[in-house]
């Protein structure tokens, strides 16, 4: 909305935000960081949730794709008064609850979690946070961590998917703005186009799926191209090739003219899917055409 790079991916985005006592004088910077980042995810199929944690976890805004609700959620976020302990695991519990229960008729949307904290997690709190982050992962989520000020990068690397999923902000809260671009680039998985977008009925084809972030999967062997045919049957196909900006996939043979296949991508062997508005349609092809 404010120009610059944006993400067109259709997935569920969870912000899990530290509102413990230590961020009391820095909540504005956290809020503006979230607000700026939230506006860069612009797919109508993207849902967002705001979760805050201190001595307990609270879902400030449940998953929604409604931009007016997101605007109201941001207003609520701005009003948060920090205080309490750093029970990060409580935040992950609230996210996992939604990841599991907020499925759409058995169709599970891919989940991305961005967790922000400013302090070191002591003993049991780190154990619980890692355990809960692992549960979110087992539910199909990709987990990123933003560490500000007195964080322990080794801890955050174990809570996040890997060291590469940690964004250290060593220069204090005012430096949060400086990592928005890199977080957007790393956390965005988007399907932009399919080539060809029209295929011949009854024939086998390969489809190039153009987009970004396809190699963000924890294991690229688990990436799948998925074709939702005429809004009912879903066929999953293993890509021949997985690159960050494209996938080369076998397209299912669609027997009839006028059939439509909506393109989705799974990063975790079909556990959950990134949606798009990219459609492949069939047409009649005469011999030699």
């Amino acid at each position: 909305e404010d120009g610059g790079p944006a993400c067109y991916g259709g997935f569920d985005l969870y912000f899990i935000l530290d509102k413990s006592g230590s961020v009391l004088h820095h909540w504005n910077e956290i809020y503006y960081f979230v607000e700026q980042l939230a506006h860069k995810f612009i797919s109508p199929q993207l849902r967002m949730s705001f979760i805050v944690f201190s001595t307990r976890g609270t879902t400030l805004m449940k998953l929604t794709e409604d931009r007016e609700q997101i605007r109201q959620g941001l207003e609520e976020l701005q009003k948060v008064l920090p205080g309490g302990d750093t029970y990060m695991h409580e935040g992950f519990e609230r996210a996992s609850e939604q990841i599991y229960y907020e499925n759409r008729q058995g169709y599970r949307t891919a989940s991305v979690i961005i967790a922000l904290t400013d302090g070191e997690l002591h003993e049991d709190l780190f154990f619980y946070s890692e355990r809960e982050a692992n549960r979110s992962r087992d539910l199909g989520a990709i987990v990123y961590c933003v560490g500000v000020k007195d964080f322990n990068e080794t801890q955050l690397a174990r809570i996040a998917d890997s060291k590469d999923h940690v964004f250290p902000v060593n220069d204090g809260f005012q430096a949060l703005q400086g990592i928005i671009h890199s977080i957007l680039k790393k956390s965005c998985i988007e399907i932009l186009a399919a080539e060809p977008s029209t295929i011949c009925a009854g024939e086998s084809f390969q489809v190039v799926v153009r987009g970004n972030g396809f190699r963000h999967a924890r294991n690229v062997d688990r990436v799948l191209c998925s074709f939702k045919i005429n809004d009912s049957v879903t066929l999953n196909e293993k890509p021949f090739s997985v690159e960050d900006t494209y996938l080369l996939c076998p397209a299912p043979i669609l027997k009839e003219v006028g059939m439509k296949a909506a393109l989705q991508v799974s990063m975790n062997d079909g556990l959950s899917f990134i949606s798009s508005s990219v459609i492949i349609t069939t047409t009649h092809c005469s011999d030699g055409s």
């Epitope: 609850e97 008729q105 058995g106 599970r108 549960r135 087992d138 539910l139 879903t234 556990l271």
Partner: antibody, heavy 118, light 107 residues
Framework: EVQLVQSGGGLVKPGGSLRLSCAAS????????MNWVRQAPGKGLEWVSS????????YYADSVKGRFTISRDNAKNSLYLQMNSLRAEDTAVYYC???????????WGQGTLVTVSS | NIQMTQSPSSVSASVGDTVTISCRAS??????LGWYQQRPGEAPKLLIY???HLQSGVPSRFSGSGSGTDFVLTITSLQPEDFATYYC?????????FGGGTKLEIK
């Protein structure tokens, strides 16, 4: 010891009501979703209802929707199933079970028999 | 609603044998499947979660496999205490559903 102890079963007439309870101990109850599952005499398992850890999400089997109400009190470490308008086909052993998706129903209560008969 | 179909409904085997029990979902459920054992007069017991993960404390002779619509529970080197009824259960979407059960009997 992790435990779920059930109470509240018994004999009730068709159209009557009953409230089942499930008391949890030995674990952080508020971190777990909870399910009710039933088993009619000589039959298989049938899922009845689920409630998420924060009570934000509640689901029922079609066969009990509108008649049964699941609830929990995290402060009391307790799960409940309020059963109204009971029918003969509701006769079963009812189990409560804890679950942390995606890890399955790993702890079950001992079961309590509900008999609906005139 | 997703239906779960188990086969066979009963199977006879001897101590030391290997048995396999199949479970089919009416639509894809990824790996959202659990296997439970129930002995007469007892509550069910979780054996396998997420299709192939062995629950803590369950002997390694139990294993699960499959993804999508077709799943298998394998019990190797059958022990006397394994003769019971086994249920699969999908947790991909609500309503949750159990299979009809497979009764494992001593031959």
């Amino acid at each position: 010891e992790v435990q779920l102890v059930q109470s509240g079963g018994g004999l009730v007439k068709p159209g009557g009501s009953l409230r089942l309870s499930c008391a949890a101990s030995g674990f952080t109850f508020s971190s777990y979703s909870m399910n009710w599952v039933r088993q009619a005499p000589g039959k298989g398992l049938e899922w009845v209802s689920s409630i998420s850890s924060s009570s934000s999400y509640i689901y029922y089997a079609d066969s009990v929707k509108g008649r049964f109400t699941i609830s929990r009190d995290n402060a009391k470490n307790s799960l409940y199933l309020q059963m109204n308008s009971l029918r003969a086909e509701d006769t079963a052993v009812y189990y409560c079970a804890r679950v942390r998706p995606p890890y399955g129903m790993d702890v079950w209560g001992q079961g309590t028999l509900v008999t609906v008969s005139s | 609603n997703i239906q779960m179909t188990q086969s066979p409904s009963s199977v006879s085997a001897s101590v030391g044998d290997t048995v396999t029990i199949s479970c089919r979902a009416s639509q894809g459920i990824s790996n959202w499947l659990g296997w439970y054992q129930q002995r007469p007069g007892e509550a069910p017991k979780l054996l396998i979660y997420a299709a192939s993960h062995l629950q803590s404390g369950v002997p390694s002779r139990f294993s699960g496999s499959g993804s999508g619509t077709d799943f298998v529970l394998t019990i190797t080197s059958l022990q006397p205490e394994d003769f019971a009824t086994y249920y699969c259960q999908q947790s991909n979407s609500f309503p949750l559903a159990f299979g009809g059960g497979t009764k494992l009997e001593i031959k």
